[in-house]
């Protein structure tokens, strides 16, 4: 904690200005006022203060606001913001998408997933739901941040939304996100002809059950095998190697790249090595021609 | 290593025949598909023949069809291209080349000359 | 048959520069095209598959684009190892087919 002292008398604070820049530590501690900074935060932007003075300044809000920033204060927190931990900013409501760029803006270029991530979390708690506006804004300004949120958070996302969100904004996605939004998407996208459905839903893909991968093998999508490999594992598996093939199209040739990676090797794994041959692609594997296959889970399930 | 090495070309007359081998090394040969594709002299490549793994499916180019057979023997990992009712047109150097549309490994090639 | 026809049949150019080489089919093939890299006394290299899909190995300057009947492979900037003679051809149906090639030579 910063040194308690009393405020010399010609070091008293009417505004918040450039002359502060060279007021020590325990100065600034001493001679500004809490609920002047933050009536005036607007104005500490644009003051080239140090990150050891920044300190001080956040110390005088924490006190002020024990239980979190009002969003007047938060809106102008500009380069402040980057002395913000997630558990400062769990304590926030933010509603304007004003306030989320000005401060997605501040964090670009710096090493602070977690904050966005809270920071976001916050927006659309304190908005209610994942509407377009916050899509758009979260698109436009950073992209990828989208996948910061938990499933839960992007459960909120109504279908009609879906449109707005852009293939590279679910590059971070995990399993369990797309598992949450490829539901929506197939219901946005659902009266679109079948090219242009699949362009529309190959990014959510990672989230398709097999049922859905199947009946895409019926409609010659050629799909490329990046979005192959972003499947579930379990989507992949129950696929026999004429599906693969024609899921695939032209692009089944790249098969034997991808051939010790997940999820084509568990695919491997549990085809025939016949039924993998006749692809001539040379993939290896299979479960050796003659041997017979049991299927366990099935007394397992009964015992 | 994968290496395709073609033999059996060289110079024969219209109407003979001729049969070439492409001995597959480096990887397991009875689990790819394998064509033929020839380049006459000064001329583009020319796909000839396609077998599939396990022999029981060949496809051939009209200008061949019924005078060339494609035949794979998997035991010894080799290819065949026999080649009957030679005609000056089919002189050309001859690859043999491993995949299944798309050709990923070709041998050096053998020339097969048909000339009276 | 398929027919593939390739322009131009030869360009020059120097290192660095962007270079295009172009494809047409004489049908729909949709994504069903390679673009083959061969240089004298070599055995032709695949470069794309399945129309613009890089294969391993290949150097990110080379990309390939286009569906259905035209399609293009473009150098982005011009290796000296780069010049040879460029192939393209079709597997969507038997039988495969080859363009004639478009030879890059060093200006």
């Known amino acids: 904690d910063v040194e308690r002292t009393t405020c010399p008398p010609e070091k008293e604070v009417h505004e918040i200005d450039e002359s502060l820049i060279f007021y020590k530590k325990r100065e600034l501690e001493a001679c500004v006022d809490a609920a002047l900074l933050a009536a005036q935060m607007d104005r500490v932007d644009a003051i080239p203060f140090t990150y050891e003075q920044l300190d001080v300044l956040k110390h005088k809000l924490d006190e002020l606001y024990p239980q979190g920033y009002p969003e007047s204060v938060i809106r102008h927190l500009g380069h402040l913001f980057l002395k913000m931990s997630p558990e400062d900013i769990r304590k926030w409501n933010v509603t304007s998408l004003e306030t989320l760029k000005a401060l997605l803006k501040v964090s670009k270029g710096h090493e602070m997933s977690a904050q966005v991530a809270t920071l976001i979390d916050r927006v659309v708690v304190g908005r209610g739901q994942l509407d377009k506006d916050t899509v758009d804004t979260l698109t436009a300004f950073c992209p990828g941040c989208l996948c910061s949120l938990s499933p839960e958070r992007l459960s909120s996302v109504p279908p009609s939304v879906i449109g707005a969100v852009r293939p590279q904004d679910l590059d971070t996605c995990g399993p369990r996100q797309l598992d949450v939004l490829y539901p929506k998407a197939r219901l946005a996208f659902q009266n679109m002809s079948g090219s242009e459905y699949f362009v529309k839903i190959r990014p959510f893909l990672g989230g398709a059950p097999t049922e859905d991968v199947k009946a895409l093998s019926q409609q010659n999508v050629s799909m490329d095998l990046a979005t192959f490999m972003k499947l579930r594992r379990e989507a992949v598996l129950p696929l026999t190697v004429a599906e693969v093939q024609k899921l695939l199209g032209p692009h089944v040739e790249g098969l034997k790249v991808e051939e010790q990676h997940s999820p084509v090797r568990d695919w491997i794994l549990k085809q025939r090595q016949d039924d993998l041959d006749t692809l001539g692609l040379g993939l290896q594997g299979g479960i050796p021609n003659g041997y017979l296959i049991l299927d366990l889970s099935v007394r397992e399930a009964l015992s | 290593e994968v290496q395709l090495v073609e033999s059996g070309g060289g110079l024969v007359q219209p109407g003979e025949s001729l049969r070439l081998s492409c001995a597959a090394t480096?990887?397991?040969?009875?689990?790819?598909?394998m064509h033929w594709v020839r380049q006459g002299p000064g001329k583009g490549l020319v796909w000839v023949s396609r077998?599939?793994?396990?022999?029981?499916?060949?496809v051939y180019a009209d200008s061949v069809k019924g005078r060339f057979t494609i035949s794979r023997d998997n035991a010894k990992n080799t290819l065949f291209l026999q080649m009957n009712s030679l005609r000056a047109e089919d002189t050309a150097v001859y690859y043999c080349?491993?995949?299944?549309?798309?050709?990923?490994?070709w041998g050096q090639g053998t020339l097969v000359t048909v000339s009276s | 048959d398929i027919q593939m026809t390739q322009s131009p049949s030869s360009l020059s150019a120097s290192v660095g520069d962007r270079v295009t080489i172009t494809c047409r089919a004489s049908q729909d093939i949709g994504s069903w095209l390679t673009w083959y890299q061969r240089k004298p006394e070599k055995a032709p290299k695949s470069l794309i598959y399945a129309a613009s899909s890089l294969q391993s190995g290949v150097p990110s300057r080379f990309s390939g684009s286009g569906s259905g009947t035209d399609f293009t492979l473009t150098i982005s900037s011009l290796q000296p190892e780069d010049f040879a003679t460029y192939y393209c051809?079709?597997?969507?149906?038997?039988?495969?087919?080859f363009g004639q090639g478009a030879k890059l030579e060093i200006k």
């Open positions: 051809q079709q597997y969507k149906s038997y039988p495969l087919t």
């Open positions: 080349a491993r995949g299944r549309g798309i050709m990923t490994y």
């Open positions: 077998i599939n793994s396990d022999g029981t499916s060949t």
């Open positions: 480096g990887f397991t040969f009875s689990s790819y598909w």
